[in-house]
Amino acid sequence: YPNASPLLGSSWGGLIHLYTATARNSYHLQIHKNGHVDGAPHQTIYSALMIRSEDAGFVVITGVMSRRYLCMDFRGNIFGSHYFDPENCRFQHQTLENGYDVYHSPQYHFLVSLGRAKRAFLPGMNPPPYSQFLSRRNEIPLIHFNTPIPRRHTRSAEDDSERDPLNVLKPRARMTPAPASCSQELPSAEDNSPMASDPLGVVRGGRVNTHAGGTGPEGCRPFAKFI
């Protein structure tokens, strides 16, 4: 199965938003200034993220406005931290066969989730919808992001991403274009596209689950239509 994720290159520039999606709704992961992490039904300045891809499928997720790294404690709680701890603030990224992405802690094995329950990631599992993420480009004007990215204490302050945290100077395209069948972006409420004017559009159905028991890999299901 081709890797459709935009996150697995050595670096993927620009701001993105991670969101969960079911047939009727979506929640964007946001990292607040106080470190609280939750979901919002729409893109916000706190859901604008930078995702740094590292070796072996690891990613580092940063909230641009909160200037906090997404981290996880030993109980599986996710939170935003100004300090980068490699054990708590790096996540293993995996694209499921249905085109959705999951992130789990290599240290504690829990999934990043917008739901309150803490669940360990098991290969081949079918996680609940609030633990499966899609990514969408940022649609919030850059003027709202007049703030530096947090310094990663284990790296040089002269790193490219430090000097141009929003990647406005040299924007990059997606490393691997998403195949239409599996990684197509959904319109958001803020889009002005024709699809957004009909956000429910009869675009596609909801989650297609090809295995009733939820133990094997899912098929490449159409993405949900949501509001």
Epitope: P41, L114, P129, Y130, N209, H211, I227
Partner: antibody, heavy 117, light 106 residues
């Protein structure tokens, strides 16, 4: 604390419309979708639709397409559900419920709508 | 659409009994299942989310289990205030409810 307070009971004639309100307090209104669920006398719970509080976009159960209109007023943190072309089988208690990603965690007290000629 | 079936549709039990209610989904829904309790004239009350997580403030005699298609709500020792109707709901695709299980006094 989170509260969802609904408008009072209504009696309507067949063919008329009814508009039920649900005022939210105790949380950031625009951070949670809101649902409408109804329950006919002696029957189970029936999901009607959902509204995005920031954009006002809605999605309704197929059964109610064309008859239900959900709106919101962010200035007063209130959502509304209007059901048109009422018939006797629409007699039910109508609830608003807050979406908490993994459950409907808070519910309004319910609004009884009676459709009778 | 995913259909939920609950069994039994009603049951009679005594205070102190162990009560088990099952909910079956027509296709796999992972752990995206919720249980509610409803008493006459009242709004539903959240008991269990994500199939097995107890909502804050809910007594520990309530527990949920299951994943995929088969789920269970268990009341370890039925109390007088537990006589009510219980509904399951799936959040995997849409927001469908099960038909409910009424627990009444034997």
């Amino acid at each position: 604390q989170v509260q969802l307070v609904q408008s009072g009971a209504e009696v309507k004639k067949p063919g008329a419309s009814v508009k039920v309100s649900c005022k939210a307090s105790g949380y950031t209104f625009t951070n949670h979708y809101m649902h409408w669920v109804r329950q006919a006398p002696g029957q189970g719970l029936e999901w009607m639709g959902i509204i995005n509080p920031i954009s006002g976009s809605t999605s309704n159960a197929q059964k109610f397409q064309g008859r239900v209109t959900m709106t919101r007023d962010t200035s007063t943190s209130t959502v509304y559900m209007e059901l048109s072309s009422l018939r006797s089988e629409d007699t039910a208690v109508y609830y608003c419920a807050r979406d908490a990603v993994d459950a409907f965690d808070f519910w309004g007290q319910g609004t009884m709508v009676t459709v009778s000629s | 659409a995913i259909q939920l079936t609950q069994s039994p549709s009603s049951l009679s039990a005594s205070v102190g009994d162990r009560v088990t209610i099952t909910c079956r989904a027509s296709q796999g829904i992972s752990s995206a299942l919720v249980w509610y309790q409803q008493k006459p004239g009242k709004a539903p009350k959240l008991l269990i989310y994500d199939a097995s997580s107890l909502e804050s403030g809910v007594p520990s005699r309530f527990s949920g289990s299951g994943s995929g298609t088969d789920f269970t709500l268990t009341i370890s020792s039925l109390q007088p205030e537990d006589f009510a109707t219980y509904y399951c709901q799936q959040l995997y695709d849409d927001f469908d409810f099960g038909p409910g299980t009424k627990v009444d006094i034997k």
